[in-house]
Structures are given as C-alpha cells and as structure tokens.
Amino acid sequence: FKVATPYSLYVCPEGQNVTLTCRLLGPVDKGHDVTFYKTWYRSSRGEVQTCSERRPIRNLTFQDLHLHHGGHQAANTSHDLAQRHGLESASDHHGNFSITMRNLTLLDSGLYCCLVVEIRHHHSEHRVHGAMELQVQTGKDAPSNCVVYPSSSQDSENITAA
C-alpha cells in the first residue's frame, strides 16, 4: 500500500482550524493478524530523506498522537492531552487519516508528516509516510479561510475550515 497526500500545501489565517489529511491507497490487508499504527509529527525541510526527523506537534510526540487499530476498524484520539492542545487525529473505514489543529498560530507553520506502519506477527513492519506543508499567515495578506493546494497540480481550492 501507499500513502497519498491529497494536498501538499495548506495556507491558513491565524486563528483558523485546519484538518491535514492523508489517505491509504492500494490493497490494504484487513486480516485479523494485521494492525495499523498511524501517527503525525513535524519534520524539517532539506533532509536527505523527508520525514526522517520526528519532532513534536504542539509539544505532543508521535506516541501522544498515534492511532492503533486493526485493519477493519476506525479510530480517533480522544485523549484529553491532545484535545487540551487543540489537536485530534482520526482514521475512518475508507483509508482517510487526518489531524485537526484548532486555533492556528504562526508557530504552527512547517512541514507535517503522516506515517502509517502495517504490523504483522511477529513484529514485522512496513512503513509509509506522506508530507505536507502548513503556512499560517497573519495580516492583510492572509486568506479569510484556509486555501489548499492539491499535490497533483498547482490549482488551489478554497475551503471553509470546520
């Protein structure tokens, strides 16, 4: 399987909410011996390998934000810890995997990575990740709502954040 990032760039005004999204593509084994570990973290541009560095999102580590479930299940973080930081990650039955960040500030700007690990017995792993950039803007040049730029082209879509 692969991870697709529908949007490679999110440009949002300060104070807005945004949902960053990844999607699992290709055949996903939903057998009873398979578990999926999914998480989000920040990383840095200019690395040899994108997303190899794992930095916290709003002081929450990849383990604070992770989802862990079988192939047939949906999951979401209901941790008080994440919600206190204005964060929630979620995963549905259709391979969509997201993190919602509330009340954006300029400090939230940066590169974000989603990572999915397919785990089989006994402890074998297959890791895939996706990357996207978040730009939080302030002042007269900031958009009124988040603008997202699809990964496949430079056409932008105006979306109203939830």
Partner: antibody
Framework: QVTLKESGPALVKPTQTLTLTCTVT?????????WHWIRQPPGKALEWIGD???????NYNPSLKTRLTISRDTSKNQFVLTMTNMDPVDTATYYC?????????????WGQGTTVTVSS | DIVLTQSPATLSLSPGERATLSCRAS??????????MNWYQQKPGQAPRLLIY???NLESGIPARFSGSGSGRDFTLTISSLEPEDFATYYC?????????FGGGTKLEIK
C-alpha cells in the same frame, strides 16, 4: 486502565508441568499486539519466554521452545503459559506483559509477578 | 541471540549526582533509522517499569531527569540528578530480533 495479573501454583515438583494464567482487564487481548511471558530467577536478570499475538499465533524463546505452550481464552480475556518438565533452575518470578509499538517494541504494562519454586 | 552487556554492574552514587548507565549490544539493534532499545527500572519485589523506548523516547509519566541516547550497538541511560527513589536496578532490552533479550542489569545504590 490496563492491568495484568498472574495466577498459578507457588510450588511445583521437578518433572511436573507448570500452568500459569494471566488475566487482562481494561483491554482486549484480541485488540492489542502481543502478550508475553517473562521470568526472572532470584537475584538474576530477566528472560523472555514467549508470546501470543492478538490473532492467536505464538512465538517462543528457542532455548525453551520444546517445553512451552502459550494459549488463550478470549472469553475470559486470559492467556496461559504451560511449561513441561519443570526443573529447580526454573525457579523464578514469572511475569506477564503487553508489548506496544513506537518505532521500537517494548513492554508497557506488566503484571505484578508470581513466584514459582521448583522443589521436591 | 543478541547479547546485551550492561556496565557497570553496580554504581554507587549520592542523591543529586548524575548517573550514566551503559548498554552494549553484540550487534546493531537499528532498523530504518530507529534503535529498538528500551530501558526499564526495577525495585525489589516489583515488576519492571518502562522508562525509555526506542533508545531516546521518554515513556509517559516518567520524570524528565531520565534520558536515553545512542544508536547501533552502544546506548546510554542518564539520570541528570538522582532522587532517592531512583536507586534501583536498571535493565536494557532489545526488540530488533527474536528472541528479545535483556541486559544483566545495573544496580544503582546509594553511596
């Protein structure tokens, strides 16, 4: 809150079979990764015995493999260690534990341990 | 099997001092940029407690005076300023290869 608790005999005679049960509360053994048995002889280091996956498949330490069976009872949310042909060198505190993943595999929850003495 | 050698076997220090515990593996425990090395604390009559996973990640609820570092074959657990409750035995454990193995332990005692 996830808790594990071992139960079984405190004393076993040489050549007998040991059966220990780990009862898990607060988490389904079919929903997690792997459920393990680990032991520690008095004053010595820890030794991994084996585990059972959420699917029911098992993995054993090669040094003990011929004597081991790990099984489970999903209706009771328990998993069971059976060790045959016990010897005094098997005297140890036996722990059950759950593993978890975070770019490493580690034991995040342990039982309190049960002491087993092998003696005639 | 991967053999983990911990040193020193016993470390005698006073509260407030810095403790440095070492663990050396007989072969690399790295995979895809991560180190499959964990550290546990054990007190007499108690089960081990996870401190550090993946060589450097602090388990939730563990005080920040504990830190882990290293990669490949050599790993270190550091306690920046010892508290009275830190005197215990510490074990490293690898999970890169079956069978999972533990080190022989380092006993941290009050000087």
């Amino acid at each position: 809150q996830v808790t594990l608790k071992e139960s079984g005999p405190a004393l076993v005679k040489p050549t007998q079979t040991l059966t220990l049960t780990c009862t898990v509360t607060g988490y389904s053994i079919t929903g997690g990764y792997n459920w393990h048995w680990i032991r520690q002889p008095p004053g010595k280091a820890l030794e991994w015995i084996g585990d059972i996956h959420k699917s029911g498949s098992t993995n054993y330490n090669p040094s003990l493999k011929t004597r081991l069976t790990i099984s489970r009872d999903t209706s009771k949310n328990q998993f069971v260690l059976t060790m045959t042909n016990m010897d005094p060198v098997d005297t140890a505190t036996y722990y059950c534990a759950r593993d978890y993943y975070g770019f490493s595999w580690y034991f995040d929850v342990w039982g309190q341990g049960t002491t087993v003495t092998v003696s005639s | 099997d991967i053999v983990l050698t911990q040193s020193p076997a016993t470390l005698s220090l006073s509260p407030g001092e810095r403790a440095t515990l070492s663990c050396r593996a007989s072969q690399s425990v790295d995979y895809d940029g991560d180190s499959y090395m964990n550290w546990y604390q054990q007190k007499p009559g108690q089960a081990p407690r996870l401190l550090i996973y993946g060589a450097s990640n602090l388990e939730s609820g563990i005080p920040a005076r504990f830190s882990g570092s290293g990669s490949g074959r050599d790993f270190t657990l550091t306690i920046s300023s010892l508290e009275p409750e830190d005197f215990a035995t510490y074990y490293c454990q690898q999970s890169i290869e079956d069978p999972w193995t533990f080190g022989g332990g380092t006993k941290l005692e009050i000087k």
